[in-house]
Structure formats: C-alpha cells, structure tokens
C-alpha cells in the first residue's frame, strides 16, 4: 500500500512543498514519486519513506508516489493547487468628461489570476459595489452600464479583483485598478446668445455680451469670443448654471467692412457656437464751413456741409437738392444772424440701420454800435432827492462799452442807483463805442425842484 | 498833447502855461491840469469842459485860470509863491475812461517860483 | 467833497509776491476809479479805469476790484519793473476836484 503526504496542497506560484512518500511493506523493491517538477530527495533513516521537496511550483501539478512490494505495485496523488493574484486589472479607458444622461460602459479585464474558482471581480463606484462576477475567460472581462447623472460629478470608478483563499486556510488577497474619474457635464443644445452692436464705427468701442443657461459645472465651461481674426479678452460672470461673457471691442480702420462675430462655449468635449455678422464702417461727422465764423453785417456767408460721399444731409433742416452728400445756403448777415446756428445732419445707411451724425457751427455777426430812443430814452424828468436809475443800453456785437457825460467831465452813472440832485441835471453826451466803431447820443436830465411842485 | 511855458518866475509875477493839441477838437473833449511839486503827490487844479464850462479846485480859485482856443489850453497863474513850484501836467479826458487813448497826458513841464 | 485816501503810503515787496493798495472814497462814487502808476521823472502811466477794466498794454498782472467807496489795486507776481509809485483818482465828480487823487503808494520791489 503506498501513501502520500500531504495529499492537497494550495502554495504560491514559483513555490516549493514538501511531500512524503510511504509504503506498508518494510522492503520495498521500488519507492518514489513522479513528477515533472525539479525535484530534490531529502534522505531519512530506514527504506519505507522518503521524503521530496518540489520546488518552482509554476501550475496546478498532481506527482504520483509509487511503490513496489512484493504483494505488488501501487501509488499515490497529491494535489497540488497555485495561487497568483492577477498580472493585470484594468478599466477600458474612457474619456473622462461624459454628458449627463448617457448610458456609460464600464469594461473590466483581468489577466490571470489563479485558482479562478476563488477569483471574483467587482466594479465599483468609490466603495459602492455595482457589479460582482466571477472571473471567467482570459482575459476575463466584467462589463456595467451607468447612466451618467449630474451628481456623479468627480466620482471615481474602479474595478477590483478578490482572490479569497480563506477556506483554505489563506487570506483574501484584492487587487485594484487605477481609478477612472469620471467628470459629468451639461451642454444645452442651444447655442449660446450673443448681444452685440450690428454695426459698430471705426476707432469706437462697442460691447459684446455672450451668455448661455443650463451649463454643468459652469466654471469649467470655456468660453471663446472673437471678432475675425481679433482674439477677445471677456470678463466672465458666473450664476449657479449660467455664465455671461462681457468684451469690450476696438476696431479701426483695417477692419472696415464685415466682421464675423463668433462665441464659442466649450464644456467636456462638447461645443457650441453663435456666428453673427457686425458691419464695421467709417462715418466722420459732416463738415459746416463758413466763409468767415465772425463777419461784420451785410457781409454775404456761405454756409456749406459736406459729408461722407455715401450720405445724405440736411443744412438747417433743409435736404440737400438733389439728395447727396453735399449742401449749401447763402445769406447776407444782419445782427439777428448772431449767434445763430447752422447745423448740418447727415444719415448713412449701414447694414440697414441708418447712421446720422451732425455738426454744428455759429456765426458770429458784428454790428453796432446802437443807441436808440426804445433802450436809451433822451429825456429824463425826476423830482430833486429821489433815488432813480438812469438806464441807457447799447446794442452792438462785440457789446460796446457805454459812457454818458455832461460837458466831458461829469458822468452819469448808467444803472447804479443815484440820489437826483441839482448836480445831476443837464445834457449828457452818451458815447457806445466798440471795435466796430462809435455812436452818440444825448440825453437830458431835468431836476424839478420841490417849490415847482 | 504837449505843455510848454514853464521854467524860472519870480514870486508876486504872472505866467500862463500853454498846452498844444493836435488830433482832436476841443470842442467834443474836456482838459484839465494837474500839478506835482518836488516830491510831493498829484493834486488837479482845475478843468475846462467841452462846453468852455470852468471847474477848480477850492484852492486854486481866483490866483488859477483855464482858458482855450480851438488848439490850445491855458493855465494862467496869478501871483506864484514858492509853493507853486512844481512840474505842471496838461490832461485830456481827465473824466472819461474807455481806455487809454481818453487819457492822454503831456509830458510836463517845470515851473519853478523863486526869487 | 469827494477826498481820496490811500493806504498804505509805502510798501515793500518780493520779486514774485503780491502787493494790495486800497484807495477809500470820502462818499461813493460809484465805480468811476482810475489807478496810476509813475516812475520816478515820467508822466503818469493810465493803469485801471472804471474800478476793475484795464487800460490796454497793460499787464493781467494788475488787478484792480471794489465799488462805492472801497476799491483795491492788486499787483501779483511782482516784478522789479512794478517798483514805482501808484496814484487812484476818482473819475466821478468834477465840480470837487480836491483831493481827486489819492496820496500815493510807494512800491520798492527787493
């Protein structure tokens, strides 16, 4: 009878083991052990037991111990099981940005592994288990599907292999993949609205405001405005799932003409995008020409406006004749033309909005200087210890300078309250004098002395 | 304007200053004289109006007279005393100020009282 | 009566400061005020007519404000040609030409 011990064994792979090999016979004609592991006899006292050690131990083995007595042959098995945890655990990779409400494939492989009986493999969302099957195949493959929700949000999946070896006396031995961060995000399928100037003048500033609602996580979403080849620089406000982008825009002459407006949001790897076309266009204010901004009276003016080629311009509220870009009047300058204004107004047609810019100019007339009876009245009667006022106003442009004296040494005081007295009374040479030249008047002051009463 | 007539007289005598005017008439502006002694202030002494119309100063009354003809403005001085010494200015418009074209001033001339 | 009186008699000054002469009318005369100035051998020179309007040439430097019976000549940023002595004169009153002019300032520029 031939024996074995141990008749099972589980070890790691590459290890060794000791195994006996006994029979019941004192003399045994023939006592060993079949194997194709290296193997090394270790010698004991007496002829029915020898003892091996089987080294390298790389697969499940079953060496055979065989005796021959002179009752006959027999043998023996001894199982011998290796354990090895996988080479290799894995998660497809995925890109790691993914919209919410997509159905999400979580693919596990293992290689190797061993026994595979003991071996099962997990998928996991942080510690929460999604799915658990034994390893099967090679490589073996586990495979989830998840429905991406806003708060899987950084969340980590990962797939764990468990070789559990406890029954056999062993531990549970876990291996785990690198971990896939999953980053969800929503993307309207609106594109962006932008709000900006249709038509903008060069060397002006204009602003452009592109916003979008319902983003997920709206402070990643990237967002790009641009103006042709001109690259915007946008201050970015954010709300709980809304941003708005706010850039101030330059243009100058070079970029006369149509513009593409684009603003881009680019969230995960997703995108959206608004086109919109701004017309960009030159448009100086008219100009008003006088012959001369100061004349003196009846001087003939020649007022012109001229504007940009394209436009159409009124000269004081009167259209150009025929309708262009250029119009003009004429007009003997009288004093009541002082001061006035000639406003030119001219109307371009951009991108169909109407564009008008105006220009005004004033003339400046000089006439005078005036004294006339109606402001400087030639009589004055008052009672001798009355306070009066004597007024006298000159009329001219530029204002003329007033003096009234009596025999070029007294002067009345224009204006100033005075108490009348017999000084006071006599003829009063007033002079108006100004760059236009110099006008006389006289004016005569009685004093009715209180005993005429 | 221009003042002539002054230099040495001797007290209790009589002497007229003369001012000459070219450019203006008369008759449309005032002229009035001014006197300054050695070191002293300005003091008016008196004027004549467009109208020939004579005003002095409380001092100057009775020993002081203006007169003119079409060209010319006189001081006649009365019985100088050494007080009178002084340069003695010929002013036009004295009164009137639209600017400094009115107040045209003789360069002066000296008048010195001593016996 | 309409007497001029001027303060101060004399007054001493730093090329680049500022001078005030005040000149007070004995009763108002409105704002008929001349102001002068004489260097020493020369004629008056026409500064300020009207209280406050300055006479043509002359510099923005001088300033001169008031009315009624208070008036001031203000020169401002001095120069050493500014040194001279500076006369007002009421312009209002002919028939009281007594003390027409004020005193006289005395201006000495260091």
């Known amino acids: 009878q031939t024996s074995v011990s141990p008749s099972k064994v589980i070890l790691p792979r590459g290890g060794s083991v000791l195994v006996t090999c006994s029979t019941s016979c004192d003399q045994p004609k023939l006592l060993g052990i079949e194997t194709p592991l290296p193997k090394k006899e270790l010698l004991l006292p007496g002829n029915n037991r020898k003892v091996y050690e089987l080294s390298n131990v790389q697969e499940d083995s079953q060496p055979m111990c065989y005796s021959n007595c002179p009752d006959g042959q027999s043998t023996a098995k001894t199982f011998l099981t290796v354990y090895w945890t996988p080479e290799r655990v894995e998660l497809a990779p995925l890109p790691s940005w993914q919209p919410v409400g997509k159905n999400l494939t979580l693919r596990c492989q293992v290689e190797g592994g061993a026994p595979r009986a003991n071996l099962t493999v997990v998928l996991l969302r942080g510690e929460k288990e999604l799915k658990r099957e034994p390893a099967v195949g090679e490589p073996a493959e586990v495979t989830t599907t998840v429905l991406v929700r806003r708060d899987h949000h950084g969340a980590n999946f990962s797939c764990r292999t468990e070789l559990d070896l406890r029954p056999q006396g062993l531990e549970l031995f876990e291996n785990t993949s690198a971990p896939y961060q999953l980053q969800t995000f929503v993307l309207p399928a609106t594109p962006p609205q932008l709000v900006s100037p249709r038509v903008l003048e060069v060397d002006t500033q204009g602003t452009v405001v592109c916003s979008l609602d319902g983003l997920f996580p709206v402070s990643e979403a990237q967002v790009h405005l641009a103006l042709g080849d001109q690259r915007l620089n946008p201050t970015v406000t954010y709300g709980n799932d809304s941003f708005s982008a706010k850039a101030s825009v330059s243009v100058t002459a070079e970029d006369e003409g149509t513009q593409r407006l684009t603003c881009a949001v680019i969230l995960g790897n997703q995108s959206q995008e608004t086109l919109q076309t701004v017309t960009i266009y030159s448009f100086p204010a008219p100009n008003v020409i006088l012959t001369k901004p100061e004349v003196s009276e009846g001087t003939e003016v020649t007022v012109k406006c001229e504007a940009h080629p394209r436009a159409k311009v009124t000269l004081n509220g009167v259209p150009a004749q025929p309708l262009g870009p250029r119009a003009q009047l004429l007009l003997k300058a009288t004093p009541e033309d002082n001061g006035r204004s000639f406003s030119c107004s001219a109307t371009l047609e951009v991108a169909g909005q109407l564009i008008h810019k105006n220009q005004t100019r004033e003339l400046r007339v000089l006439y005078g200087p005036r004294l006339d009876e109606r402001d400087c009245p030639g009589n004055w009667t008052w009672p001798e210890n009355s306070q009066q006022t004597p007024m006298c106003q000159a009329w001219g442009n530029p204002l003329p300078e007033l003096k009234c004296l009596k025999d070029g040494t007294f002067p009345l005081p224009i204006g100033e309250s005075v108490t009348v007295t017999r000084d006071l009374e006599g003829t009063y040479l007033c002079r108006a004098r100004s760059t236009q030249g110099e006008v006389t008047r006289k004016v005569t002051v009685n004093v009715l002395s209180p005993r005429y009463e | 304007v221009e003042e002539s007539g002054g230099g040495l007289v001797k007290p209790g005598g009589t002497l007229t200053l003369t001012c000459t005017v070219s450019g203006f008439s008369l008759s449309t502006h005032a002229m009035g004289w001014v006197r300054q002694a050695p070191g002293k202030g300005l003091e008016y002494i008196g004027i004549i109006g467009s109208s020939d119309r004579t005003y002095y100063a409380s001092w100057a009354k009775g020993r002081f007279t203006i007169s003119k003809t079409s060209t010319t403005v006189d001081l006649k001085i009365t019985s100088p005393t050494t007080e009178d010494t002084a340069t003695y200015f010929c002013?036009?418009?004295?009164?009137?100020?639209?600017?400094?074209?009115?107040?045209?001033w003789g360069p002066g001339t000296l008048v010195t009282v001593s016996s | 009566a309409y007497d001029m009186t001027q303060t101060p008699a004399s007054v001493e000054v730093a090329v680049g400061g500022t001078v005030t002469i005040k000149c007070q009318a004995s009763?108002?005369?409105?704002?008929?005020l001349s102001w002068y100035q004489q260097k020493p051998g020369q004629r008056p020179k026409f500064l300020i007519y009207?209280?406050?309007k300055v006479a043509s040439g002359v510099p923005s430097r001088f300033k001169g404000s008031g009315s009624g019976t208070e008036f001031t000549l203000t020169i401002s940023a001095v120069q050493s040609d500014d040194a001279a002595t500076y006369y007002c004169q009421q312009a209002y009153s002919s028939s009281n030409v007594d003390n027409a002019f004020g005193g006289g300032t005395e201006v000495m520029v260091k």
């Open positions: 009763q108002s005369i409105y704002s008929y």
């Open positions: 002013v036009r418009d004295p009164y009137d100020s639209f600017d400094d074209g009115y107040r045209l």
């Open positions: 009207d209280a406050s």
